[in-house]
């Protein structure tokens, strides 16, 4: 790795291309400049994503996979770099771009929202759950009346087209339901969703969006919530939700409502049992909800509250504070 003393001239990479390899996924490829004289030095490359969202990183290899939305187009640059004597030598940039797909912006869907949910699976003898996906959207304000939309998702290497749509009064698809998917609920890959469309009157602009699973995964409420009063102790127990996450991966909130004085107690915990000291002469309704803890995944959504459980009696005796 000997460097000559004279000034090193770095040349930009050649044959820089951007290829769409999947839904919301591109492959950037380039080649070292064949005229680069210093072949025995450790050349690196700096990749700069210009649009739709700025980013830059360094790599030693001559290709790079990017997960990105594409409905706004995509633009990137790459240059040759060399670290030498605590300074950075760099070539000029080589650039390439993908143009935004055709269609008026007002024809694409708006307010695309998706949620995943874990449900029981009757077909699997080892993993008793499956992950469903539900997405909804609004018709574009400038979309012709005959517009029809079609939704696809990609998770990892799997891309699937929606087979079950809900329609508006004009017969246009406005929601999609996948009862089972290839989504790993414990995975860290982005979920990519694309909604494209067709019309006899104009080009419908596609719309794609990336979702982080932890942000859209609708956790199920805890199961089998029970509550009983023994003297002044209200004992509450429950089981973990239907979920691919194991028992140690949940945080819980318990809500105890005193029906007589309206007092509300909310406690957060990591175990699946809770004991509260209470006024044994009141009636209480108890609910529990769950969320995947940050030990197992980035913070996400709380489940709905479980159905209320009613305990205690409704006697009109003098109030005692909690």
């Amino acid at each position: 790795d000997l460097l000559p003393d004279d000034k090193i001239s770095l040349l930009p990479p050649v044959n820089f291309t951007i290829k769409v390899t999947g839904l919301a996924q591109v492959l950037l490829r380039w080649e070292p400049n064949p005229d680069q004289e210093q072949r025995n030095v450790n050349l690196e490359y700096q990749v700069k994503i210009n649009a739709p969202k700025e980013d830059d990183y360094e790599t030693r290899i001559t290709e790079s996979k990017c997960v990105t939305i594409l409905h706004k187009g995509f633009s990137a640059s790459v240059r040759t770099i060399l670290q030498k004597d605590h300074s950075l030598l760099a070539s000029s940039w080589a650039s390439a771009e993908l143009h935004a797909p055709p269609g008026s912006p007002g024809t694409s869907v708006v307010n695309l929202t998706c949620t995943t949910n874990t449900t029981a699976d009757n077909y699997s003898y080892l993993r008793p759950y499956q992950v469903s996906l539900h997405c909804t959207w609004l018709v574009g304000t400038d979309a012709p009346e005959d517009t029809q939309y079609f939704l696809y998702y990609r998770y990892g290497s799997w891309t699937e087209e929606c087979q079950e749509y809900s329609k508006d009064s004009m017969g246009r698809n406005i929601a999609c339901w996948f009862p089972r998917t290839f989504i790993h609920s414990r995975g860290r890959d982005w979920l990519a969703v694309l909604v494209n469309g067709s019309s006899k009157h104009s080009a419908i602009k596609p719309f794609d969006q990336l979702f982080a699973l932890h942000a859209i995964d609708q956790i199920n409420p805890p199961l089998n919530v029970t509550a009983e009063i023994k003297g002044t102790r209200l004992s509450i127990q429950w089981e973990k939700p239907v979920s691919a996450f194991p028992i140690h991966c949940f945080d819980y909130e318990v809500k105890i409502h005193n029906a007589r004085n309206g007092y509300l107690q909310i406690e957060k915990m990591m175990t699946n049992a809770f004991i509260s000291i209470i006024d044994d002469l009141s009636k209480y309704d108890v609910q529990v909800r769950a969320a995947v803890s940050s030990m197992c995944r980035e913070a996400g959504l709380w489940s709905e509250w479980s159905q209320p459980i009613y305990v205690g009696k409704d006697e009109h005796k003098p109030l005692r504070q909690w």
């Epitope: 003898y125 759950y129 992950v131 290497s157 087209e161 790993h184 691919a244």
Partner: antibody, heavy 121, light 113 residues
Framework: QVQLQESGGGLVQPGGSLRLSCAAS????????MSWVRQAPGKGLEWVSA????????NYADSVKGRFTISRDNAKNTLYLQMNSLRAEDTAVYYC??????????????WGQGTMVTVSS | QSVLTQPPSVSAAPGQRVTISCSGS?????????VHWYQQLPGTAPKLLIY???NRPSGVPDRFSGSKSGTSASLAITGLQAEDEADYYC????????????FGGGTKLTVLR
């Protein structure tokens, strides 16, 4: 119980074609994603291809992409692998297996007994 | 060259405990992806032995157990028996590869007579 029975293997010349079949029984075939996994003589396991339950979405290993096509006929409970432009390195026992994902990394819970494909001149 | 690295062979006497390692990287096991293990007895098709790191399908003896830490996974077999002599494969998911499904190269377990 689940039964998978491969057929269609044999000797073929380089550049030739072969179509493997896998007959499934003992489970609701149309509810499951399915896969092909191969094993060259004396070597390890290599995942080849997979197809979703409805047959509309497929996946391939880089080593076979553009040459092999996976398909299924849910009415006949049968999985297929059409192999074109065969090479010597495709010589292997080909196993049909279910491709169980549900909520995590796919695993292969049930396997056929395999069918031998030999590519040689 | 497999993405997941296993020792080519291990051996132990009957009754002993043996472990088989499966070493990966940040793009597979190190990202928290599940690891599965298969047993392939001589002349037969592979059989799922452990799924989701440490779960056994029904019928698999509790002498077999799986574990995972960092970028590696391990299969442990206690009270080794002659019928455990087989090839063992780990399998996971690699986000950097097309298709994503990856196997280890396999480990031949020999039970010493």
């Amino acid at each position: 119980q689940v039964q998978l029975q491969e057929s269609g293997g044999g000797l073929v010349q380089p550049g030739g074609s072969l179509r493997l079949s896998c007959a499934a029984s003992g489970f609701t075939f149309s509810n499951y994603a399915m896969s092909w996994v191969r094993q060259a003589p004396g070597k390890g396991l290599e995942w080849v291809s997979a197809i979703n339950s409805g047959g509309k979405s497929t996946n391939y290993a880089d080593s076979v992409k553009g040459r092999f096509t996976i398909s299924r006929d849910n009415a006949k409970n049968t999985l297929y692998l059409q192999m074109n432009s065969l090479r010597a390195e495709d010589t292997a026992v080909y196993y049909c297996a279910d491709y169980a994902t549900n909520y995590g990394v796919p695993y292969f819970g049930s396997w056929g007994q395999g069918t031998m494909v030999t590519v040689s001149s | 060259q497999s993405v997941l690295t296993q020792p080519p062979s291990v051996s132990a006497a009957p009754g002993q405990r043996v472990t088989i390692s499966c070493s990966g990287s940040r793009s597979n096991i190190g990202s928290g992806y599940d690891v599965h293990w298969y047993q392939q007895l001589p002349g037969t098709a592979p059989k799922l032995l452990i799924y989701d790191d440490n779960n056994r399908p029904s019928g698999v003896p509790d002498r077999f157990s799986g574990s995972k830490s960092g970028t590696s996974a391990s299969l442990a077999i206690t009270g080794l028996q002659a019928e455990d002599e087989a090839d063992y494969y780990c399998q996971s998911y690699d986000s950097s590869l097309s298709g994503h499904v990856v196997f280890g190269g396999g480990t031949k377990l020999t039970v010493l007579r």
